[in-house]
């Protein structure tokens, strides 16, 4: 806490300008009017204040706005944003996407800080849902943003927002998240033709059920192995050798390189060895010829 001292004669700040960098902390406290600072916040960023001086300026704003800063001030915080705590940010009501962008720009190139996470949370909650423009903005600054949300939070993403998602935005998503996103993507892209649809839906296929994979296998999509390896094991297991061959097209020979990784390994164990042999890839581990396969799950369903 800076001690309250009178401003020396002739030092009262008429405006926020570079002369203030020569003020000591106590002089800034005594000579800069908080209301003036609030109206000229856009100038602060252009002035090379020290971290200690910025602390004083923050303190003045905190005194002026104990219930939280207005958006007109927040939008122009610039580097002063880095001085804010999550507790400060929780008091704010940020509704403008421009304000959000301005603050994200300050943190650009860094990991998502607790301050930024709090800011985004406040903004999204204020909007009620993750609309396309917001998602566009957030993934531009933080490609992993989408995958940092819980499945519950993702359920508030409207299908229309899915158009903003790029493949790299889904790189760190786990299967539970893709389970939520896939049906939204399917809905968003439903009016596209076969090949265009596949290009768009490909990144979301880690949440696709068996019947959708079977449907894709009829469309000459030539899925690559990187995508196939991300599919849900339970969705891949029921596929026949012929369906996998159609699904992968020329990439089918890649199964050999991945035969010990899931889901390929588990799928191989479910296939008849003579069916696997038809691929000519040297895949081993299928059900030996002459063995009877009992589908116990089907038996339980019938009983």
């Amino acid at each position: 806490e800076v001690e309250k001292t009178a401003c020396p004669s002739g030092k009262k700040a008429r405006e926020i300008d570079e002369s203030l960098i020569f003020y000591k902390k106590w002089e800034l406290e005594a000579c800069v009017d908080a209301a003036l600072l609030a109206t000229q916040m856009d100038r602060v960023n252009a002035i090379p204040f020290t971290y200690e001086q910025l602390d004083v300026l923050k303190h003045k704003l905190d005194e002026l706005y104990p219930q939280g800063y207005p958006e007109s001030v927040i939008q122009h915080l610039g580097y002063l944003f880095l001085k804010m705590s999550p507790e400060d940010i929780r008091k704010w009501n940020v509704t403008s996407l421009e304000t959000l962008k301005a603050l994200l720009e300050v943190n650009k190139g860094h990991e998502m800080s607790p301050q930024v996470a709090t800011l985004i949370d406040r903004f999204v909650k204020g909007r009620g849902q993750l609309d396309k423009d917001t998602l566009d903005t957030l993934t531009a600054f933080y490609p992993g943003y989408l995958c940092s949300l819980s499945p519950e939070e993702l359920s508030s993403v409207p299908p229309s927002s899915i158009w903003a998602v790029r493949p790299q935005d889904l790189d760190t998503c786990d299967p539970r998240q893709l389970d939520v996103l896939y049906p939204k993507a399917r809905l968003a892209f439903q009016n596209m033709n076969g090949s265009e649809y596949f290009v768009k839906i490909q990144s979301f296929l880690g949440g696709a059920p068996t019947e959708d994979l079977k449907a894709l296998s009829q469309q000459n999509v030539s899925m690559d192995l990187a995508t196939f390896m991300k599919l849900r094991t339970d969705a891949v297991l029921p596929l026949t050798v012929a369906e996998v061959q159609k699904l992968l097209g020329p990439h089918v020979e890649g199964l050999k390189a991945e035969e010990r990784h899931r889901p390929v390994r588990d799928w191989i164990l479910r296939q008849r060895q003579d069916d696997l042999d038809t691929l000519g890839l040297g895949l081993q581990g299928g059900i030996p010829n002459g063995y009877l396969v009992l589908d116990l799950s089907m038996q339980e369903a019938l009983s």
């Epitope: 790189d171 990187a226 390896m229 890649g254 050999k256 390189a257 990784h261 899931r262 890839l281 040297g282």
Partner: antibody, heavy 119, light 108 residues
Framework: EVQLVQSGAEVKKPGASVKVSCKAS????????MDWVRQAPGQGLEWMGD????????IYNQKFNGRVTMTEDKSASTVYMELSSLRSEDTAVYYC????????????WGQGTTVTVSS | EIVLTQSPDFQSVTPKEKVTITCSAS???????LSWYQQKPDQSPKLLIY???NLASGVPSRFSGSGSGTDFTLTINSLEAEDAATYYC?????????FGGGTKVEIK
């Protein structure tokens, strides 16, 4: 430019563990498996195992009998190889090598990390 | 595991000469699953040939590969000084993946 940059040389005592990192850049990290290959002084190449950075799935050469663990950090585009219960025969240069998912050949290699095990 | 035996272990060759390195597998290897690597002293290995005969990107055309079943060959048609290195064959047809013992090529 595609690059695999490995952590620096290590000197360890027998029985200890070593963890080598391999940071990938210049390509889509999750489209390639990362394999680890080692080379003892004056010797040939020996495949240790691989990891799929997308799923975290691993395959290990049984020769390493539970001593090797491979992990990934997708957010940092980095994979790690930890070898435990070190013995003098583990003295080698350890390489990470990129392998496109669905192929079995290594098209880009790290610069290698020398691990010396000595009492 | 499949053992890959390379011969010769060492070869001293004059520039412009043809070099042939063989890689013999203890069990049959599907030809798509065999590759060759070049390693120069104090460097990491470099992919030379994949799928028995396909040249990797940037590899000069004097290198070629052939073979099937248990016998595979790497040929350097007209050796150049920069080709001094150790060459390894590698199979991923059968687990665990294995490399040959290497053939060191020296320039006379």
């Amino acid at each position: 430019e595609v690059q695999l940059v490995q952590s620096g040389a290590e000197v360890k005592k027998p029985g200890a563990s070593v963890k080598v990192s391999c940071k990938a850049s210049g390509y889509t990290f999750t489209d390639y498996n990362m394999d680890w290959v080692r080379q003892a002084p004056g010797q040939g190449l020996e495949w240790m195992g691989d990891i799929n950075p997308s799923t975290g799935g691993t395959i290990y050469n049984q020769k390493f009998n539970g001593r090797v663990t491979m992990t990934e950090d997708k957010s940092a585009s980095t994979v790690y190889m930890e070898l435990s219960s070190l013995r003098s025969e583990d003295t080698a240069v350890y390489y990470c090598a990129r392998r496109r998912i669905g192929t079995g050949y290594f098209d880009v290699w790290g610069q290698g990390t020398t691990v010396t095990v000595s009492s | 595991e499949i053992v890959l035996t390379q011969s010769p272990d060492f070869q001293s060759v004059t520039p412009k000469e043809k070099v042939t390195i063989t890689c013999s597998a203890s069990s049959s290897v599907i030809s798509s699953y065999l590759s060759w690597y070049q390693q120069k002293p104090d460097q990491s290995p470099k992919l030379l040939i994949y799928r028995t005969s396909n040249l990797a990107s940037g590899v000069p055309s004097r290198f070629s590969g052939s073979g099937s079943g248990t016998d595979f060959t790497l040929t350097i048609n007209s050796l150049e000084a920069e080709d001094a290195a150790t060459y390894y064959c590698h199979q991923w047809s059968s687990f665990p993946y294995t490399f040959g013992g290497g053939t060191k090529v020296e320039i006379k």
